[in-house]
């Protein structure tokens, strides 16, 4: 560093835990949503909701920010005819996505709020409420039953009545479907013309019950029971139904595939193709066979359109196809062999001829990169728009491809926005315009573009306040590197202090996630507790996407099948070894952290020996670690380890109990909320039993009655401080030891 640079850096503040929770660092997402060819709705930083017309360059206020504030509303939604707004308030989270809340309707712009309730109850807490696709039609869900309202002011009618609280869910996910299968609490789907509603009926009656304890707030602790299928136990059963909303409500079940491999199945995707045809993906329990069908909503008959099979497991089963207007042509993503690195995810088009039962299938894209999302299909312009990793696995650029002729590809976002390589996007209904959301590496921003020439029309949100805060701080320097293991090039991300010099010795913190198919090394903007470790406490943080990670081909992804932990340990240790070769890393101060599956891995690799058979890690921490996959969710564990009960060797081999007996003097901090509904405290209890048996050193920090996702910001702040303090202390102890050792050496001299 030149002295000038050094001075400017020294004047900059370090990133603190307070910063993580301050308004200065809060990214504002306008949540812009196209509602027509030329208009989108978005929310300003001050809270006002506006409608913007990109052709006339004018905006209209729909809801004043003050109104949202006065209602104490958490969420808002505007009716398709823009006459009414639906607000939710007093919202209570249930699981990751689901919540209950009170709802009110209000005429735009200044109408008085009117409560939304089922006919039989007033002031009811609803599980869901939302507009349909047309006019003012809306549905809401109360006590697992679905109610329909044709327009505001009309009496709601109950259209599905089979619900049973906590047992039979209509139009909503149970725990497993919300967390592992659909990855949303919403399990209902409107037909595009608003005449029909498809909904999932999920039956948990045979699923074993888990009880979450509540220790505080009453003299005797209470429990909250809910159905949670652990590996090998009875799973929820699911059926898909369609009800007609014009006239008497006729309920019709869509018939699952008649296939012996589908004796037990999940429904992973539902998407309307036309107003009478609905696409459904059915996945067998073993998650190695999936069938995509097109179901006739008037008869319930489902026709097979595509089948997928895997020797390992089928990944990315939630993705929705994109249809032509008549539903005869659809684009979907599937894994296609691309040579040595296995399969990569590419766009395939399936076209059916009017008088033929055979569908013509063609690949639109190919190469050793992944299409990560299909965004839109311009039928008139014969173009498909998508995001992909073609640039680099750690990036997401926006591309278009011709859907006729030579399938020519064009990158629309490459070099379009400065300091932006990781994008998401959405297109106006006519595809003439698109909203481009930059997610990094620079401060996130949202811009509006003309599709014809990619030209930026205007900035919708630039988050200038965050840019300013970032410029005033000593932000980490980010570097990328690849490491070579067994014919694989594995990406690594290194965060170094802003004042980094290679003559100083820095502690090393390895942060692991490693959930199969996930990605830790990405060019996304992030300010987290890791940033604080680097900026305020001079640590070097490293992340590595090893075998089992996503976006680098299915060969790499599927390597971990039936042996979770084994190869990830090798790869993460190789990343550490690579870093330890650097002069600037202090090999006596090396730590590891992970949460959830990453907590499993951090616990798994903490005892790992270095090249000289000495311990590599000084300390480690795990937040809500999975410690035994037979205690974890059926859909997750069975996907990677097979069906528990058929062959349990994989389950036995992956237990961390076998590893922790090798823990020596390392400090080990385990953190677990006691009401964790996803990874039960039971995992930590089992682990600690083994640690005690092995006379290992550990500390345990619990969060009484807190759930997995730490919804309270004060608790989150406490959590981050705890983790940071643990590592700072761990690194400081080594400082003391080094000083003592140095003094002893001097005395000997």
């Amino acid at each position: 560093l030149t002295p000038a640079e050094d001075n400017s850096l020294s004047q900059k503040k370090k990133v603190t835990v307070e910063d993580l929770f301050s308004e200065d660092f809060k990214i504002h997402d306008p949540e812009a949503k196209w509602i027509s060819d030329t208009e989108f709705i978005y929310r300003e930083q001050k809270g006002t909701v506006r409608l913007w017309n990109v052709e006339t360059n004018t905006s209209t206020v729909l809801i004043e920010g003050k109104k949202i504030e006065s209602l104490r509303a958490i969420r808002y939604e505007i009716s398709p005819d823009r006459e009414y707004a639906l607000f939710s308030y007093n919202v209570e989270p249930i699981y990751q996505h689901s919540y209950t809340g009170y709802y009110v309707l209000s005429k735009i712009p200044h109408g008085d709020p009117q409560s939304l309730d089922p006919p039989e109850v007033s002031n009811a807490k609803l599980q869901y409420a939302g507009w349909g696709p047309k006019g003012q039609q809306l549905i809401f869900i109360f006590e697992n039953n679905i109610y329909y309202c044709a327009h505001v002011g009309k009496q709601a009618i109950r259209v599905v009545s089979t619900g049973k609280e906590g047992v039979i869910y209509n139009g909503l996910s149970d725990w497993l479907y919300e967390e592992e299968i659909l990855k949303t609490h919403i399990a209902h789907w409107w037909s595009p013309d608003g005449t029909r509603l498809a909904y999932a009926a999920i039956n948990d009656s045979r699923v074993p019950i888990m009880e979450l304890p509540t220790y505080t707030g009453s003299i005797y602790p209470t429990v909250k029971p809910y159905h949670y299928p652990k590996a090998g136990s009875e799973n929820p059963s699911i059926s898909l139904h369609v009800i007609g909303l014009n006239g008497p409500t006729h309920d019709l079940e869509m018939m699952p595939p008649d296939d012996p491999r589908m004796r037990e199945y999940y429904i992973t995707m539902v998407k309307w193709a036309t107003s009478t045809k609905v696409a459904v993906t059915w996945l067998n329990r073993a998650q190695n066979v999936s069938i995509l069908t097109l179901c006739d909503a008037t008869t319930g008959v489902c026709t097979k359109k595509h089948e997928d099979e895997s020797e390992a497991w089928l990944h990315r089963q939630n993705e929705e196809p994109v249809f032509s207007k008549d539903g005869r042509k659809f684009f979907f993503i599937r894994a296609i062999p691309q040579g040595g690195r296995g399969k990569f995810y590419h766009i395939t088009v399936s076209s059916s001829q009017p008088n033929s039962s055979n569908d013509n299938i063609q690949s639109i894209t190919s190469g050793d990169w992944d299409v990560t999302k299909i965004l839109a299909y311009d039928e008139k312009g014969n173009k498909i728009y998508f995001l992909s990793t073609e640039d680099l696995p750690r990036r997401r650029q926006l591309y278009s491809a011709n859907t006729v002729g030579n399938f020519n590809r064009q990158c629309l976002s490459c070099d379009l926005v400065e300091n932006c390589t990781y994008f998401s996007a959405s297109f106006s209904h006519s595809m003439d315009f698109f909203l481009l959301k930059c997610e990094g590496p620079g401060v996130p921003m949202v811009t509006v573009h003309n599709t014809t020439d990619k030209k930026k029309m205007f900035d919708l949100e630039t988050n200038e306040h965050v840019k300013k805060a970032i410029n005033d701080r000593q932000m980490p320097k980010v570097e990328y590197r690849d490491i070579e293991i067994d014919d694989y090039n594995l990406p690594m991300q290194i965060l170094k202090p802003a004042t980094f010099t290679d003559t100083t010795h820095y502690p090393l913190l390895l942060v692991v996630d490693g959930t199969p198919g996930s990605q830790s090394v990405a060019e996304k903007f992030e300010v987290s507790w890791e940033t604080v470790m680097v900026s305020s406490h001079g640590a070097v943080v490293v992340k590595c996407d090893g075998r089992g990670s996503g976006f680098q081909g299915t060969k790499l992804l599927h390597e971990v099948r039936r042996r979770l932990g084994l190869l990830e340990e090798k790869d993460q240790m190789e990343a550490v070894r690579t870093m330890l070769k650097e002069q600037y890393i202090d090999r006596t101060r090396v730590a590891v952290f992970g949460k959830d599956y990453g907590g499993y891995l951090s616990t798994y690799i903490l005892p790992a020996k270095g090249e000289n058979q000495g311990q590599t890690f000084t300390c480690g921490s795990a937040l809500s670690p999975i410690t035994d996959f037979k205690l974890y969710a059926s859909a997750f564990s069975e996907r990677y380890l097979g069906l528990h009960g058929l062959d349990n060797r994989a389950y036995e081999m992956t237990k961390v109990a076998h590893r922790v007996s090798a823990l020596e003097e390392q400090q080990f901090l385990i953190i677990h909320p006691t009401a964790d509904e996803k990874i039960h405290f039971q995992h930590t209890a089992e682990l600690i039993t083994q640690l005690i048996r092995g006379k290992a050193n550990y500390s345990l920090q619990i969060y009484p009655d807190e759930s997995h996702y730490f919804t309270s910001s004060s608790l989150k702040q406490h959590l981050y401080r705890s983790i940071i303090n643990f590592f700072v202390e761990c690194f400081r102890i080594q400082d003391k030891l080094l000083t003592v050792t140095a003094k002893e050496d001097e005395e000997e001299d």
Epitope: D37, T38, N53, E55, E83, K134, G135, K325, H429
Partner: nanobody, 130 residues
Framework: QVQLQESGGGSVQAGGSLRLSCAAS????????MAWFRQAPGKERERVAS????????NYADSAKGRFTISQDIAANTVYLQMNSLKLEDTAMYYC???????????????????????WGQGTQVTVSS
Amino acid sequence: QVQLQESGGGSVQAGGSLRLSCAASSYTYSYSCMAWFRQAPGKERERVASIHTGTGTANYADSAKGRFTISQDIAANTVYLQMNSLKLEDTAMYYCAARPGSAALRCTTDYSKPHDFTYWGQGTQVTVSS
């Protein structure tokens, strides 16, 4: 709550005239692609004429050129179809359709199929007799 309401249909002699009206809610009307479609018994619904309410640009199907005129009254949120020199083959149910927030250029060049439109009226019958 009705988004579009047609009126003005009826029976007329060949060679005669009729004026159809389509009243829209302010939302359905503003900056929309408004179109008149017709459907004769046993035939598919076809577009007759369309107008972009933001720009006033109009477009006609070949069968309507020179005989029909689409126009609008912005203050009344109403679109009209003036039909002159009516022929027997003009007998059909006439529907008003709207695509709110339409791109102006797309309205007059691309939007010709029923699935391009979001909102529909109930229809008004036009019968031409000899």
